[in-house]
Interface confidence: low
């Protein structure tokens, strides 16, 4: 079989809410993937599993099932949303994200995604990892690629 290419494009939007009492931040992060099928037969995108890490801690997970079928030599753009929670031992971030004296409250998150495709009864998994900036202080819609954090090293928090 020819390759199935998965390209993580970036964060599409991040919607934020807070629990003042619990000093907790809720971020619903919608990401965009391009999946290209270089085969001459359709492949099924069986599932997408994603997780988001902040400072090496998993803050959100999501799984989508039976997503789509991608035709031969075709590409589909797929959006998926990961609900994340920044709380407990990371509640110190609540102060940063709600600080009104700064305009942009960017935090660096690591997006991990695994796409499982099937064809002719075979399964194939392709994984990607990307660091992305997300504003935890307001609802934000991003132009694709705008949120990329280009430093390949794990950033210090």
């Amino acid at each position: 079989p020819r390759s199935i290419d998965v390209k993580y494009i970036g964060v599409k939007s991040a919607y934020v809410s807070y629990d003042v009492q619990k000093r907790t931040i809720y971020l619903n992060i919608t990401n965009t993937l391009n999946i290209t099928n270089n085969n001459y037969y359709s492949v099924e995108v069986e599932n997408i599993t994603a997780q988001v890490q902040f400072s090496k801690t998993v803050i959100g997970k999501a799984r989508l099932n039976n997503i789509t079928i991608i035709g031969p030599l075709d590409m589909k753009q797929i959006d998926y949303t990961v609900p994340t929670v920044i709380a407990e031992e990371m509640s110190y971030m609540y102060d940063f994200c709600t600080l009104i004296s700064i305009k942009v409250h960017n935090i660096v998150l690591m997006m991990q995604v695994t796409v499982t495709t099937t064809y002719f009864g075979h399964s194939e998994q392709i994984s990607q990892e990307r660091y992305q900036y997300v504003d935890c202080g307001r609802n934000t819609t991003y132009q694709l690629g705008q949120s990329e954090y280009l430093n390949v090293l794990q950033p210090q928090q």
Partner: antibody
Framework: QVQLQQSGPELVRPGTSVKVSCKAS????????IEWVKQRPGQGLEWIGV????????DYSEKFKDKATLTADKSSNTAYIQLSSLTSEDSAVYFC???????????????WGQGTSVTVSS | DIQMTQSPSSLSASLGERVSLTCRAS??????LNWLQQEPDGTIKRLIY???SLDSGVPKRFSGSRSGSDYSLTISSLESEDFVVYYC?????????FGGGTRLEIK
């Protein structure tokens, strides 16, 4: 019923190019691939390449990458193969064929055009 | 590229006889193999797809099977219109490759 009607025979000069057409009818053109296959006189079949008429995406056998260009016109349900810098080696019958695509059947050419004879001669 | 070695290249047989043609794949192709028939006027028709599935309208005397990397087309009782050329085609990977063909001749 499904039909792939190819254009008529061509007699062309060396060094020129030729465009062969394959008009599809009896099915949804953009839901199937169109494959192209070459057959030299008295020889076997050789796969040239494939086009997805829906998006126009193509892929070619390495051997034909610089020789053949595949295109498709959705408005007329017609696929084309253009052969360039023709030599006597390009004298052959060219077939188009339809391929259903499905996760389970995969590439499985089910209907063939009648073939178009291209003769390269000075 | 996957090589498809088809044998025999020609075969003489009598009406009513049972014959088998074979294609050997150089790599694993699963069940992704077709058998094609080419008439003297050049017309190509698919007989068998996915190794053993018979196309609609194809007589039941044609059948396809597999044993390891060997794929066979069997004609149980030859009729006059069967004396043409047959090709196998693998569609497991790109580029698609054909067997060299078998010319079936009347004895």
């Amino acid at each position: 019923q499904v039909q792939l009607q190819q254009s008529g025979p061509e007699l062309v000069r060396p060094g020129t190019s030729v465009k062969v057409s394959c008009k599809a009818s009896g099915y949804a053109f953009t839901n199937y691939l169109i494959e192209w296959v070459k057959q030299r006189p008295g020889q076997g079949l050789e796969w040239i390449g494939v086009i997805n008429p829906g998006g126009g995406n193509t892929d070619y056998s390495e051997k034909f990458k610089d020789k053949a260009t595949l295109t498709a016109d959705k408005s007329s349900n017609t696929a084309y193969i253009q052969l360039s810098s023709l030599t006597s080696e390009d004298s052959a019958v060219y077939f188009c064929a339809r391929s259903p695509y499905s996760s389970y059947v995969g590439y499985a050419v089910d209907y063939w055009g009648q073939g178009t004879s291209v003769t390269v001669s000075s | 590229d996957i090589q498809m070695t088809q044998s025999p290249s020609s075969l003489s047989a009598s009406l009513g006889e049972r014959v088998s043609l074979t294609c050997r794949a150089s790599q694993d192709i699963g069940s992704n193999l077709n058998w094609l028939q080419q008439e003297p006027d050049g017309t190509i028709k698919r007989l068998i797809y996915a190794t053993s599935s018979l196309d609609s309208g194809v007589p039941k005397r044609f059948s396809g099977s597999r044993s390891g990397s060997d794929y066979s087309l069997t004609i149980s009782s030859l009729e006059s219109e069967d004396f043409v050329v047959y090709y196998c085609l693998q569609y497991a990977s790109s580029p698609r490759t054909f067997g060299g063909g078998t010319r079936l001749e009347i004895k």
